[in-house]
């Protein structure tokens, strides 16, 4: 069973996880960002399911289409350079979900812009982090 | 001084056309983003849409989009705003706002207009 | 869109008396460049909006020193150390780390 230690690392984590997320949105979705437009052109696949920490997994593999994109982002948008970003999303996420399950990401129909894709990750860690506190 | 003076409100039918003038003076009109902004009475105010300080690039609110085009004239200091397929939804004081696109202030909407009324009824 | 929530939405004060405003986010209005692009507005009957504050904390020219702005992340507060006849109308908080979105304006009266 998890401990309340256990249950603050992993919310502490989420709340990191969350910032991150937010905070490459607000970069991204913003009028005056110059290759917003030329982003949302981009296609990210969405999870079928979020609901529990092993579905972080449909996140993993779209860190590297994330990256990618986000190098096309001006250095006035990110005062982090998206490699460093991305890293440390990895960290979190290799630890929120565990590495001792292997789990398959099922993926919905639809795909999404990185605006939609980031929301939904972002929803997800609300999800997760109201049910811990 | 600074100053921007909104025209071309009215009352209009609803599926009618109307466009909003904004005149800027009193600065350099061509380094600033411009905005619109609306209120509906009583109500708060709603964006509505943002064109770049040298029209390259210009969004729009959910609401608005594809009946709203946002333009302007950086020869004559003037921002636009054609209003097509007009619905009641749409009756508001229309504001337009300066944004500081060069600086490094980062003001935001620092000066704006007194507004024009459009009012869409049948 | 980011939603942005004010409370109160009507507030009666006394003359020389201080006055709060809260604003919340929906989500952190952080970006990467470290900014927080959070405005406080004020619109008297008739008036188009003036702006006060920028980012946080900045007062706008001529704003008067007993306007503040405080908050980090998701949570702002407008505070007037002590309110004058002319500070009555509708205050908006609005952010432009996204796309514009205002809260929904705090009346402040003198009771």
């Known amino acids: 069973a998890p401990t309340s230690s256990s249950t603050k690392k992993t919310q502490l984590q989420l709340e990191h996880l969350l910032l991150d997320l937010q905070m490459i949105l607000n970069g991204i979705n913003n009028y005056k960002n110059p290759k917003l437009t030329r982003m949302l052109t981009f296609k990210f696949y969405m999870p079928k399911k979020a609901t529990e920490l092993k579905h972080l997994q449909c996140l993993e593999e779209e860190l590297k289409p994330l990256e990618e994109v986000l190098n096309l982002a001006q250095s006035k948008n990110f005062h982090l350079r998206p490699r460093d970003l991305i890293s440390n999303i990895n960290v979190i996420v290799l630890e929120l979900k565990g590495s001792e399950t292997t789990f398959m990401c099922e993926y919905a129909d639809e795909t999404a812009t990185i605006v939609e894709f980031l929301n939904r990750w972002i929803t997800f860690c609300q999800s997760i982090i109201s049910t811990l506190t | 001084q600074v100053q921007l003076v909104e025209s071309g409100g009215g009352v209009v039918q609803p599926g009618r056309s109307l466009r909003l003038s904004c005149a800027a003076s009193g600065f350099t009109f061509s380094n600033y983003g411009m905005h619109w902004v609306r209120q509906a009475p009583g109500k708060g105010l709603e964006w509505v849409t943002v064109?770049?300080?040298?029209?390259?690039?210009?969004y729009y609110a959910d609401s608005v989009k594809g009946r709203f085009t946002i333009s302007r004239d950086n020869s004559k200091n003037t921002l636009f705003l054609q209003m097509n397929s007009l619905r009641a939804e749409d009756t508001a004081v229309y504001y337009c706002?300066?944004?500081?696109?060069?600086?490094?202030?980062?003001?935001?909407?620092?000066?704006w207009g007194q507004g024009t009324t459009v009012t869409v009824s049948s | 869109d980011i939603v942005m929530t004010q409370t109160p939405l009507s507030s009666p004060v006394t003359l020389g008396q201080p006055a709060s405003i809260s604003c919340r986010s929906s989500q952190s209005l952080v970006r990467s460049d470290g900014n927080t692009y959070l405005s406080w507005l004020h619109q008297r009957p008739g008036q188009p909006p003036r702006l006060l504050i920028y980012k946080i904390s900045n007062r706008f020219s001529g704003v008067p020193d007993r306007f503040s702005g405080s908050g980090a992340g998701t949570d702002f507060t407008l505070k007037i150390s002590r309110v004058e006849a002319e500070d009555v109308g509708v205050y908006y908080c609005?952010?432009?780390?996204?796309?514009?979105?205002f809260g929904q304006g705090t009346k402040v009266e003198i009771k």
């Open positions: 064109i770049w300080n040298d029209g390259s690039n210009e």
């Open positions: 706002a300066r944004e500081d696109w060069l600086g490094e202030a980062d003001y935001g909407m620092d000066v």
């Open positions: 609005m952010q432009t780390t996204q796309f514009p979105t």
